[in-house]
Amino acid sequence: VPLSRTVRCTCISISNQPVNPRSLEKLEIIPASQFCPRVEIIATMKKKGEKRCLNPESKAIKNLLKAVSKERSKRSP
């Protein structure tokens, strides 16, 4: 008997709002998997340590990801 897969994504709401990269403590990108069939992006804010789920399809969020990866590539030797 095949095991029934429980779909368990952590994000139930998503934000399309632009996020200032400087206000980010951490950005987690969780790839799609057998447990959650969509990419999830979880932003942890510097000021209060609160987390927010971002919409991977939003233009503003795509721009944020570009800005963050650009910043990272600058820092790496």
Epitope: R8, C9, T10, I12, S13, S15, R52, C53
Partner: antibody, heavy 120, light 108 residues
């Protein structure tokens, strides 16, 4: 105006079914998870179920699992709760509530509530 | 699922400060939220996350979190603050929500 308007409560016999509706307006419904919370007469709040912004994920309290189904129609900005095999202990005021939008689930907008009475 | 523990009854003299607490294992992973409910009315969110007040909630309401305990503080309690207060959070599994049993606040 940002609001949730509920309908569908009433008196129902044990073992029967009932469907609750919650019409949302004034916010981007398709971006937010939506919850049902209930309150038995004279008792505290009890979380019932949540559905993700796109309807792909649904989570339930153990007390209603297998009997209640949460669903949504983003084209109509409406949330539903289908309640089957109702029991006397399901008697309560049922509230729909909008998720706050952050990682820690919470409820920043509530409907006025609708009373469901399960009685023979 | 995990539980949140609240004192059933708390009283405060008019204009004084009162703290309502909420304890539970889930609070080490998730922030608590706080709701005010008056008889015959739907609950109203008063504090969410790390001390966030929705617009329209007076600044005498504040929240704090430490370990497995969350607190709601009302600084200078008013007669209209008399109500039931519930804390809530995602439970330890992360896929359900748990509420405390509620605290009845009396303003003397």
């Amino acid at each position: 105006e940002v609001q949730l308007v509920q309908s569908g409560g009433g008196v129902v016999q044990p073992g029967r079914s009932l469907r609750l509706s919650c019409a949302a307006s004034g916010f981007t419904f398709s971006s937010y998870g939506m919850h049902w919370v209930r309150q038995a007469p004279g008792k505290g709040l009890e979380w019932v179920a949540v559905i993700s912004y796109d309807g792909s994920n649904k989570y339930y309290a153990d007390s209603v699992k297998g009997r209640f189904t949460i669903s949504r129609d983003n084209s109509k900005n409406t949330l539903y709760l289908q309640m089957n095999s109702l029991r006397a202990e399901d008697t309560a005021v049922y509230y729909c509530a909008k998720d706050g939008g952050w990682y820690d689930w919470y409820f920043d907008l509530w409907g006025r509530g609708t009373l469901v009475t399960v009685s023979s | 699922s995990s539980e949140l523990t609240q004192d059933p009854d708390v009283s405060v003299a008019l204009g004084q400060t009162v703290r309502i607490t909420c304890q539970g294992d889930s609070l080490t992973s998730y922030y608590a939220s706080w709701y005010q409910q008056k008889p015959g009315q739907a609950p109203v969110l008063v504090i969410s996350g790390n001390d966030n007040r929705p617009s329209g909630i007076p600044d005498r309401f504040s929240g704090s979190n430490s370990g497995n305990t969350a607190s709601l503080t009302i600084t200078g309690a008013q007669a209209e603050d008399a109500a039931d207060y519930y804390c809530g959070s995602r439970d330890s599994s992360g896929y359900q929500v748990v509420f405390g049993a509620g605290t009845k606040l009396t303003v003397l």
